[in-house]
């Protein structure tokens, strides 16, 4: 008899699963790039924007050599869950100015949720633990002003774009090591 119902199935071809995660990540990267460009057109950014509640960057040229699939997938999932929370917060608390981007933000959220489900599936197929975030969840209060929500949107989209960019490179690299 096979494994009991509900137990994680170890995939026969993890490369194919990883391929599909790469495709979704690339697709979300392109969407985020497009939305970030729209943001810049509608609300030009004056310099750089950051939010303390956003995750710190997990990958760089220096970390590529030591990447391990479990660590990358776990960290990516935790970071993307944080970005999902920030996108949801933007949609809820962003104010009238960001309402013009509501369809795009909604689509971005749906794509992000889809990628998270794909990563979760990949982790269960590889029998990896579904780790909970190790950092405390910072409650997101309402933006101080309309301009504050625009600055936050720039920071969230910029950070998400950068995270996805590195994620594609990391996942591609890990695929070659499987």
């Amino acid at each position: 008899p096979g494994p009991p119902a509900g137990s994680p199935r170890v995939s026969s071809d993890p490369r194919a699963d990883l391929d599909s995660a790469v495709l979704l990540t690339r697709s979300l990267l392109a969407d985020t790039r497009q939305l970030a460009a729209q943001m810049r057109d509608k609300f030009p950014a004056d310099g750089d924007h950051s939010l303390d509640s956003l995750p710190t960057l997990a990958m760089s040229a220096g970390t590529l050599g030591s990447l391990q699939l479990p660590g990358v997938l776990t960290r990516l999932r935790v970071d993307l869950m944080s970005y999902l929370r920030h996108v949801q917060w933007l949609r809820r608390a962003g104010g009238p100015s960001l309402k013009t981007l509501e369809p795009e933000l909604g689509a971005l959220q749906a794509r992000l949720e889809r990628l998270l489900r794909r990563l979760q599936l990949l982790m269960s197929r590889l029998a990896l633990p579904q780790a909970a975030p190790d950092q405390p969840v910072i409650p997101l209060g309402p933006p101080a002003s309309a301009w504050g929500s625009i600055r936050a949107a720039h920071a969230i989209l910029g950070g998400l774009h950068l995270t996805l960019d590195w994620a594609v490179r990391g996942l591609l690299l890990l695929k070659t090591r499987l």
């Epitope: 690339r26 990267l29 950014a45 310099g47 750089d48 924007h49 950051s50 960057l57 760089s60 040229a61 220096g62 970390t63 910029g158 950070g159 774009h161 950068l162 960019d165 590195w166 594609v168 490179r169 591609l172 690299l173 070659t176």
Partner: antibody
Framework: EVQLLESGGGLVQPGGSLRLSCAAS????????MNWLRQAPGKGLEWVGV????????FYADFVKGRFTISRDNSKNTLYLQMNSLRAEDTAVYYC??????????WGQGTLVTVSS | QSVLTQPPSASGTPGQRVTISCSGS????????VNWYQQLPGTAPKLLIY???LLPSGVPDRFSGSKSGTSASLAISGLRSEDEADYYC???????????FGGGTKLTVL
Amino acid sequence: EVQLLESGGGLVQPGGSLRLSCAASGFTFSHYDMNWLRQAPGKGLEWVGVISYDGSNKFYADFVKGRFTISRDNSKNTLYLQMNSLRAEDTAVYYCARTPGSHFDYWGQGTLVTVSS
Amino acid sequence: QSVLTQPPSASGTPGQRVTISCSGSSSNIGNNAVNWYQQLPGTAPKLLIYYDDLLPSGVPDRFSGSKSGTSASLAISGLRSEDEADYYCAAWDDSLNGVVFGGGTKLTVL
């Protein structure tokens, strides 16, 4: 708007040293790996090296190992390239470029380094 | 000599479709993303295609990239006079632990 502005190029004698700077603005500099690339007159592009966003890791092309050093000061939003033991074949326009993953998404306008006696 | 191989020149007439090839090995193109850069005369290079076929903001969709095995190609449809430039392919090389470029292709619009 993302801007990268190189400076410090000029004429230097073989065996001499030069320090290039790249001033960054319009983005969170401390979040990005940064690179130096070069292009000899009439030739193609050549990657010199990369430094990670926090400065903890550096990788160099074989032709500059031991002679060139990349560093950064995140508090000043500035990238540096210290070039020692310069040779005639190091004559080129040097560019700094930002890396958000596998590619160079923004480049500076370049600064010319001429190594000649 | 460049690690990645590109034709030194290519040409086409306005409105035509032109393709530029780039070939490498398993340690670069085979295992890593390919990026393309455009360098207009007298200017700094500009990112044209990343992760094999993605377009950065502001790049017209007349430009497209593709990859198969250890080769990649850049296609430009509806050629315009302003496309006259040098085009470079690039990829990370696992053996060299660095970025490698093609020698560049000079595109002339006739």
